[in-house]
Interface confidence: low
């Protein structure tokens, strides 16, 4: 089941998935001046069996001016600098993600891909948040969000993270304004069953990653 919405936006923060659940789609988009090759894939799809998950299809871009270039190579460092993504969609592998069954790793970049990756997440996906440079985190709980199915609808849990500027000294964790949860009430008050299949294993994995999640994003 695809999640209907994007993960929540937190001011001055970015989010990143450490691994992608089977069923996740990644659009094959090309940067300006390039296009998908004719008969090229529309998207990559995370698929797998009980022991191994991988991305089906490959994204390939070619110059809009030419018709025969179909090469697909990892960009050189100077090309990588063009990827000014706002959501840190970069191939980061801080831990061995083979330990998370039913998930795919971040796909490697393809030549001339668009500057931002758009994923279509599925229920059960977890993403992690970090404050952008120049802001520091005030935690009131996990800085993560999970796409859950509730009452037949998908929703993302609210990450408990506030990012404050380094110079701001007036706000302390005890002074934070409470943030409303998506349905306007605390999540503990929701009255229907929420499926939590593999959230626990992801949370445990997150704990081991805390210091290294966001260390290799493109500059």
């Amino acid at each position: 089941e695809l999640c209907d919405d994007d993960p929540p936006e937190i001011p001055h923060a970015t989010f990143k998935a450490m691994a992608y659940k089977e069923g996740t789609m990644l659009n094959c988009e090309c940067k300006r001046g390039f296009r998908r090759i004719k008969s090229g894939s529309l998207y990559m799809l995370c698929t797998g069996n009980s022991s191994h998950s991988s991305w089906d299809n490959q994204c390939q871009c070619t110059s809009s001016a030419t018709r025969n270039t179909t090469k697909q190579v990892t960009p050189q460092p100077e090309e990588q600098k063009e990827r000014k993504t706002t959501e840190m969609q970069s191939p980061m592998q801080p831990v061995d993600q083979a330990s998370l069954p039913g998930h795919c790793r971040e796909p490697p970049p393809w030549e001339n891909e668009a500057t931002e990756r758009i994923y279509h997440f599925v229920v059960g996906q977890m993403v992690y948040y970090q404050c952008v440079q120049g802001y520091r985190a005030l935690h009131r709980g996990p800085a993560e969000s999970v796409c859950k199915m509730t009452h037949g609808k998908t929703r993302w849990t609210q990450p408990q993270l506030i990012c404050t500027g380094e110079m701001e000294t007036s706000q302390f964790p005890g002074e934070e304004k409470p943030q409303a949860s998506p349905e306007g009430r605390p999540e503990s008050e929701t009255s229907c069953l929420v499926t939590t299949t593999d959230f626990q294993i992801q949370t445990e994995m997150a704990a081991t990653m805390e210091t290294s999640i966001f260390t290799t994003e493109y500059q």
Partner: nanobody
Framework: QVQLVESGGGLVQAGGSLRLSCAAS????????MGWFRRAPGKEREFVAA????????LYAGSVKGRFTISRDNGRNMVYLQMNSLKPEDTAVYYC????????????????????WGQGTRVTVSS
């Protein structure tokens, strides 16, 4: 579910301009590609223009290229179609469409590729 509501249609003289707007609500707007289609009286629905989620990719039908401009405002969940130098043959009901399929600049999108549609807004160009 995504809901789309068009506005801005009306009666205009040939050579005039109109700006159509499409307001999207529900579901994910930012990750969806958006398009405009039109249906003239007695004709099939035809592609007019489309814009990708990243605004990196804009496509136009040959008949409107250079006259129409598609744009989007992801912050406001809006898509626009600026129509200049209108001709009587531009008379039609204009529909806003959305989906999360990537756009391909080597293929003109078809109506079947888009899963979400507005009710349409009528544009009449008099000579």
């Amino acid at each position: 579910q995504v809901q789309l509501v068009e506005s801005g249609g009306g009666l205009v003289q040939a050579g005039g301009s109109l700006r159509l707007s499409c307001a999207a609500s529900g579901g994910t707007f930012r990750t969806r590609n958006m398009g405009w289609f039109r249906r003239a009286p007695g004709k099939e629905r035809e592609f007019v223009a489309a814009v990708s989620w990243s605004v990196d990719n804009k496509l136009y039908a040959g008949s409107v290229k250079g006259r129409f401009t598609i744009s989007r405002d992801n912050g406001r969940n809006m898509v626009y179609l600026q129509m200049n130098s209108l001709k009587p043959e531009d008379t039609a009901v204009y529909y806003c469409a959305a989906d999360n399929i990537p756009l391909s600049s080597d293929m003109r999108p078809t109506a079947t590729e888009f899963g979400y549609w507005g009710q349409g807004t009528r544009v009449t160009v008099s000579s």
